[in-house]
């Protein structure tokens, strides 16, 4: 049994890091493998992650971590029984994929303005809370070409757009994702999308 593709990990910079790797053949990850991880710190204890299958030869493990900060560095040991298959390390702050924003809501009752709001996925005491910026994707269910991205570079998790910038009388969907420049993160996954019917009063033509 050998590791074909070494583990690569990403952290949500809060409580979970996800590591993925590939073996050289079909593997029952949960029964044959264990990923041990330990913070390089005074008094830290070793933890064991039981991997799940991710395709025939692929494995994925969700590592639980408390109180993640920049200085944290973890040792990783991948075991098959008594055999050490791979040894490495992982610094969560250098491989951050933020959590996806939640509770995306479209408020259509503000005079011909669409107000989109969503929730910051981090608690206020997490460093990323004040450093997320967002991308909002709006698209028409009827017209695949009617697809737009709005970059929200301020901290407020909201976006206002004139309803008239979208077509009237048709349904639209929106979703939002986040990233943080300070840690050079990847983009988060998209939030679940929300749907609304866009209608507004056309101005009278003179």
């Amino acid at each position: 049994m050998k590791v074909l593709q070494e583990p690569t990990c990403v952290s949500d910079y809060m409580s979970i890091s996800t590591c993925e790797w590939k073996m050289n053949g079909p593997t029952n990850c949960s029964t044959e493998l264990r990923l041990l991880y330990q913070l390089v710190f005074l008094l830290s204890e070793a933890h064991t992650c039981i991997p799940e299958n991710n395709g025939g030869a692929g494995c994925v493990c969700h590592l639980l971590m408390d109180d993640v900060v920049s200085a944290d560095n973890y040792t990783l040991d991948l075991w098959a029984g008594q055999q050490l298959l791979w040894k490495g390390s992982f610094k969560p702050s250098e491989h951050v994929k933020p959590r996806a924003p939640g509770n995306l809501t479209v408020h259509t009752n503000v005079s011909d303005t669409l107000l989109l709001t969503w929730s910051n996925p981090y608690p206020p005491d997490n460093y990323l809370y004040n450093h997320l910026t967002y991308a909002v994707n709006i698209w028409s269910e009827n017209d695949p070409a009617d697809f737009r991205i709005y970059n929200v570079t301020y901290l407020e998790p909201s976006l206002r757009i004139a309803a008239s910038t979208l077509k009237s009388g048709i349904s639209y969907r929106a979703r939002v994702r986040a990233w943080a420049q300070c840690y050079n993160t990847t983009w988060s996954e998209w939030s679940p999308s929300t749907k609304w019917h866009n209608s507004y009063r056309e101005p009278f033509e003179q």
């Epitope: 710190f41 005074l42 204890e45 109180d67 900060v69 200085a71």
Partner: antibody, heavy 116, light 111 residues
Framework: QVQLVQSGAEVKKPGASVKVSCKAS????????MHWARQAPGQGLEWMGI????????SYAQKFQGRVTMTRDTSTSTVYMELSSLRSEDTAVYYC?????????WGKGTLVTVSS | QSVLTQPPSVSAAPGQKVTISCSGG????????VSWYQQLPGTAPKLLIY???KRPSGIPDRFSGSKSGTSATLAITGLQTGDEADYYC????????????FGTGTKLTVL
């Protein structure tokens, strides 16, 4: 919100022991390390040791080895710091502080006076 | 005895800028992250800067931190009378299984 509430001031005689408590609230007690530091009057901060509330393991500054004991009670989310064989130079304010590499939350401090 | 050296005192007038240095070595600052604490008279220390240059929420951007080699610096701009306090740098010693260490402390006087 996170709170660390320390026990009240103590006056002790040389040679005696003192046990200072630090009750934590507003977070998952076993998920965060707790440190103890002290500050003698007009002096700087001095680290004493650390306890991992999850398993109760400890590590102490060499200066206090053999004289200090840190324990925790998970049922009450409280950590304790006991210092024995007290001498006059142990007169100080003793702080508990939550964190790993740096400490964002501190108790208000407990003044321990050692005097004959 | 602290192995992180700070100037005993610094002073400046309101509105001015002041810097406080913290000098260490390769087994501490040179190989670690630095934090800074403010201690107002009669109170517990308060975290001002962590991870060399990050501010906890609620700390104004008048406070900034930097690190270069085996030294770190705290800068305070737009000095206010309420900034008069003792300031401590902190890091950990990689030669003693990550035991924390503090600087000697600096008394800031706002003239």
């Amino acid at each position: 919100q996170v709170q660390l509430v320390q026990s009240g001031a103590e006056v002790k005689k040389p040679g005696a022991s003192v046990k200072v408590s630090c009750k934590a609230s507003g977070y998952a007690f076993t998920s965060y390390y707790m440190h103890w530091a002290r500050q003698a009057p007009g002096q700087g901060l001095e680290w004493m040791g650390i306890i991992n509330p999850s398993g109760g393991s400890t590590s102490y500054a060499q200066k206090f080895q053999g004289r200090v004991t840190m324990t925790r009670d998970t049922s009450t989310s409280t950590v304790y710091m006991e210092l024995s064989s007290l001498r006059s130079e142990d007169t100080a304010v003793y702080y508990c502080a939550r964190g790993k590499w740096w400490w964002q939350h501190w108790g208000k401090g407990t003044l321990v006076t050692v005097s004959s | 005895q602290s192995v992180l050296t700070q100037p005993p005192s610094v002073s400046a007038a309101p509105g001015q800028k002041v810097t406080i240095s913290c000098s260490g070595g390769s087994s501490n600052i040179g190989n670690s992250y630095v934090s800074w604490y403010q201690q107002l008279p009669g109170t517990a220390p308060k975290l001002l800067i962590y991870d060399n240059n990050k501010r906890p929420s609620g700390i104004p951007d008048r406070f900034s931190g930097s690190k270069s080699g085996t030294s770190a610096t705290l800068a305070i701009t737009g000095l206010q009378t309420g900034d008069e306090a003792d300031y401590y740098c902190g890091t950990w010693d990689t030669s003693t299984t990550y035991h924390p260490i503090f600087g000697t402390g600096t008394k800031l006087t706002v003239l």
